[in-house]
């Protein structure tokens, strides 16, 4: 396993109908054509795995399960969106990135992007 | 809902392993995110692990982190929990649960709705 350079934002505040969009872009040494992208969430003292992607270089970002993210990738950044989010879901979104192939395998981990989520105020009753 | 029955508890010495199982039956098992929980003595019930419908997300709490897997085998209606690098204060009744809903960013609050009865985990130095 080989170490490898992850970046993205320090802070993104998602919008009001609760969506989060960041770029993860990773430093690839190599030519790789199978790639593995993971969102972590770190917070409440937990570790969990938001949604997974696994693409060949370029073709579209394939999620694993009911997954709340979309997402695009050009080069080597991947350009995610995490939907449905609440002012409880506000924490550490994690990058992590693996070259699945060719050999050899390289990870790397962002230090992640603190995701803020306003609740929106209820509208008032209106007479109108 | 689903009917859950843990086994796989005991007593062990610290630095031990114990793998625990959970057998469901009654609905279609894939539908649910199943997630661990535990209860030691005097304290309330804890968020262990959960893992997703298909088995290739999952969380855990920081606590048991690199210490304990979490599986699923979705055709024989089964969820594991494998402990290593057991530790004096696992000891606790673990509790599997099952949650009808897809996943999301917090698992530990998903509304779970089916229980088992719990089994002892006890860790002795």
């Known amino acids: 396993c080989k170490a490898m350079h992850v970046a993205q934002p320090a802070v993104v505040l998602a919008s009001s109908r609760g969506i989060a969009s960041f770029v993860c872009e990773y430093a690839s040494p190599g030519k790789a054509t199978e790639v593995r992208v993971t969102v972590l969430r770190q917070a409440d003292s937990q570790v969990t795995e938001v949604c997974a992607a696994t693409y060949m270089m370029g073709n579209e970002l394939t999620f694993l399960d009911d997954s709340i993210c979309t997402g695009t990738s050009s080069g080597n950044q991947v350009n995610l969106t995490i939907q449905g989010l609440r002012a409880m879901d506000t924490g550490l979104y994690i990058c992590k990135v693996e070259l699945m192939y060719p050999p050899p395998y390289y990870l790397g981990i962002g230090n992640g992007t603190q995701i803020y989520v306003i609740d929106p105020e209820p509208c008032p009753d209106s007479d109108f | 809902e689903v009917q859950l029955v843990e086994s796989g508890g005991g007593l062990v010495q610290t630095g031990g392993s114990l793998r625990l199982s959970c057998a469901a039956s009654?609905?279609?098992?894939?539908?649910?995110?199943m997630g661990w929980f535990r209860q030691a003595p005097g304290k309330d019930r804890e968020f262990v692990a959960a893992?997703?419908?298909?088995?290739?997300?999952?969380s855990y709490a920081d606590s048991v982190k690199g210490r304990f897997t979490i599986s699923r085998d979705n055709a024989k209606k089964m969820a594991y929990l494998q402990m290593n690098s057991l530790k004096l204060e696992d000891t606790a009744v673990y509790y599997c649960?099952?949650?009808?809903?897809?996943?999301?960013?917090?698992?530990?609050?998903?509304?779970?709705?089916?229980w088992g009865q719990g089994t002892q985990v006890t860790v002795s130095s």
């Open positions: 649960a099952a949650a009808p809903v897809p996943w999301g960013t917090r698992p530990s609050t998903f509304p779970y709705d089916s």
């Open positions: 893992i997703s419908r298909s088995g290739n997300l999952k």
């Open positions: 009654g609905r279609t098992f894939s539908n649910y995110t």
